[in-house]
């Protein structure tokens, strides 16, 4: 049903009534684009640090993967964990940070002319909500290896950031993912690894570009927790 899908798309850390029932499968939870909410076209972020429960990598942010927080831990208790940087150990591609992939148990750069031609995945939009095409064509999209010879341009459907051309990342757009521009200095960013800003936003942003990190804007330090603005800033 839509609610079960939207359960992972809700604003989860706002005070009631906006964040009351979220995070419980089957509850009447509804979607909003990430941690955006109305108020003079401002993009507002929340700074509470809470692990976000997940069932699969796609439920986490672009810089996270889904796993048990303890080695050999209960498989039924999984949360979004920070992605692994280059040269760190891994078991699958999703564990590695954007721009890397898992090779022989180690995260390595995917920029070294790497091409995952063996990938053939099918995205089936089987959610409870209606996914109609504007022209009435099929809703089933198969991403075959042929698509990966040229990296996805802006707006192309993708599975992960390494499918996108340089300067783009794979970010959520409704219930699909498309290549969007990596954020530049001064652009508003979403602080990941926080409950409620976990990457299943309907309109998800990319991460900050090389040499930048998502930090609270200096002149917003005095603002309340619920209205802290994060921007991409030089390290």
């Amino acid at each position: 049903t839509l609610n079960s899908v939207l359960n992972s798309n809700a604003i989860k850390n706002l005070p009631p009534p906006l964040g009351g029932a979220a995070g419980h499968p089957g509850s009447a939870v509804s979607a909003a684009p990430g941690i955006l909410y109305p108020g003079g076209n401002k993009y507002q972020t929340i700074d509470n640090y809470q692990p976000y429960p997940c069932a699969e990598d796609e439920e986490c942010g672009t810089d996270e993967y889904c796993a048990s927080p303890t080695r050999g831990g209960d498989a039924g208790v999984q949360i979004c964990l920070a992605c692994r940087k280059r040269r760190k150990r891994c078991m699958r591609h999703a564990m590695c940070c954007p721009g890397n992939y898992c090779k022989n148990g180690i995260c390595v750069s995917s920029d070294q002319n790497h091409f995952r031609g063996e990938i053939e995945e099918t995205i089936t939009e089987s959610f409870g909500n209606d996914h109609s095409t504007l022209d009435g064509y099929s809703r089933r999209t198969t991403l075959s290896s042929k698509m990966y010879h040229t990296k996805g341009q802006e707006g192309s459907v993708c599975l992960r950031s390494s499918d996108c051309a340089s300067g783009l990342c794979c970010a959520r757009h409704f219930w699909s993912k498309i290549c969007k521009p990596v954020l530049k200095e001064g652009q508003v960013c979403t602080k990941h690894r926080r409950k409620g800003s976990h990457g299943l936003e309907i309109f998800q942003r990319c991460y900050c570009g090389e040499g930048l990190s998502c930090r609270i804007q200096k002149d917003h330090h005095q603002a309340s927790n619920s209205s802290r603005l994060h921007t991409c800033q030089r390290h």
Partner: nanobody, 117 residues
Framework: EVQLVESGGGLVQAGGSLRLSCAAS????????MGWFRHAPGKEREFVAG????????YYADSVKGRFTISGDNAKNTVYLQMNSLKPEDTAVYYC??????????WGQGTQVTVSS
Amino acid sequence: EVQLVESGGGLVQAGGSLRLSCAASGRTFSSYGMGWFRHAPGKEREFVAGISWTLGRTYYADSVKGRFTISGDNAKNTVYLQMNSLKPEDTAVYYCASDESDAANYWGQGTQVTVSS
């Protein structure tokens, strides 16, 4: 900066219809898509319908499927929500939001829809 302005809300009897409009101005980048959301007192904000210019798809919440229709014109920076067979539970402030290619997301100020029984 993109400004979104909703209009078309009002008071209507159950079973009636309303057509909401959302106009975007100040856009210097293209939009990937736009969506309608609603927030009723004491409830979480809820996704209602969306339209992706990029993917050529429309999306609907179960609660409005078959009653509401989203449409729009990306070139004119406008999106519409045709609401038929309205129910009292559709009463809420309706907001439109935009997914912009300048990496920003924008919200309108909302328009009140009240459905009396």
